[in-house]
């Protein structure tokens, strides 16, 4: 049976917590990703940014989970208008920012 949206978001939050907690070496070798606008369509925008990071096992589960939240197919090199133009940040910072934002969405009952 399908997982309730609240459970899926809780699991995504906990996965991001695990990533930040277990970070010993620079996450994804310090790879840079496009910063995104966190105000709308956050799941697809986050996936569009993170999908361009390859060969980083630490975020593979996050990429899969974000894919479950995004209603359309996302492929590498694809960017929506939600990207913050010409601003790149490290994956580690991206994950931290995304985590805080998702915790706020959970509090507000915005599960999908």
């Amino acid at each position: 049976s399908p997982v309730p949206p609240s459970t899926a978001l809780k699991e995504l939050i906990e996965e991001l917590v695990n990533i930040t907690q277990n970070q010993k070496a620079p996450l994804c070798n310090g790879s840079m990703v496009w910063s995104i606008n966190l105000t709308a369509g956050v799941y697809c925008a986050a996936l569009e940014s993170l999908i361009n990071v390859s060969g980083c096992s630490a975020i593979e589960k996050t990429q899969r989970m974000l894919n479950g939240f995004c209603p359309h197919k996302v492929s590498a090199g694809q960017f929506s208008s939600l990207r913050v133009r010409d601003t790149k940040i490290e994956v580690a910072q991206f994950v931290k920012d995304l985590l805080v934002h998702l915790k706020k969405l959970f509090r507000e009952g915005q599960f999908n």
């Epitope: 917590v17 930040t20 907690q21 805080v100 915790k103 706020k104 509090r107 009952g109």
Partner: antibody, heavy 122, light 108 residues
Framework: QMQLVESGGGVVQPGRSLTLSCAAS????????MHWVRQAPGKGLEWVGV????????HYADSVKGRFTITRDNSKNTLNLQMNSLRVEDTAVYYC???????????????WGQGTMVTVSS | SYILTQPPSVSVAPGQTATITCGGN??????VHWYQQKPGQAPVLVIY???DRPSRIPERFSGSNIGNTATLTISDVEEGDEADYYC???????????FGGGTKLTVL
């Protein structure tokens, strides 16, 4: 300015009842979740309970559940804490505090009253 | 129910940095708030939502929340920072607000 003022504290015998009030002013009371927090002498903060902005929901700490009741009157900007079957361990300063209301009440308390002392003693 | 663990006391010299921790199981998945309380006064919010600071709070106050530990950091500590500090979270599983036991910050 924005203010919360508690009243109704005093000395009461174990087993008796007491009602505390919290008068709000300077902000739109009906849009905030309201909490009660207490602090026993020399001890830390203990959450007592919360009532949602529209009064539709309440949650209580296990230590007071079934004995304490939180109500509010949004037309009068007042919050009440009805305390029954009081125990010696309920002795504390009682604070009311506001928190912006979301779907879940995980918001910070951005405004506190100055507190009212309740002493339960025989 | 959910438990938050704080050190009972932290001491620091003026001008140094004070670090106050708040431990809880997977606390990184929760939004953490911090309060300062001086003797005889009501608590005051100093950090909310892990790391946000109310406008009236100096930039010397900052917060972080990773894994099982949330941290309140006060840089360039002043005598006026001497107070009790409490962390707080909402526990979704029990619908309870939870406070840590508090940490007394002493400025030497």
């Amino acid at each position: 300015q924005m203010q919360l003022v508690e009243s109704g504290g005093g000395v009461v015998q174990p087993g008796r009842s007491l009602t505390l009030s919290c008068a709000a002013s300077g902000f739109e009371f009906r849009t905030y979740g309201m909490h009660w927090v207490r602090q026993a002498p020399g001890k830390g903060l203990e959450w007592v309970g919360v009532i949602w902005d529209d009064g539709s929901n309440t949650h209580y700490a296990d230590s007071v559940k079934g004995r304490f009741t939180i109500t509010r009157d949004n037309s009068k900007n007042t919050l009440n804490l009805q305390m029954n079957s009081l125990r010696v361990e309920d002795t504390a300063v009682y604070y009311c505090a506001r928190a912006p209301q979301w779907y879940l009440t995980a918001e910070a308390f951005d405004l506190w009253g100055q507190g009212t002392m309740v002493t339960v003693s025989s | 129910s959910y438990i938050l663990t704080q050190p009972p006391s932290v001491s620091v010299a003026p001008g140094q940095t004070a670090t106050i921790t708040c431990g809880g199981n997977l606390i990184g998945a929760k939004l953490v708030h911090w309060y300062q309380q001086k003797p005889g006064q009501a608590p005051v919010l100093v950090i909310y939502d892990d790391s946000d600071r109310p406008s009236r709070i100096p930039e010397r106050f900052s917060g972080s929340n990773i894994g099982n530990t949330a941290t309140l950091t006060i840089s360039d500590v002043e005598e006026g920072d001497e107070a009790d500090y409490y962390c707080q979270v909402w526990d979704y599983s029990s619908d309870h607000m939870v406070f840590g036991g508090g940490t007394k910050l002493t400025v030497l």
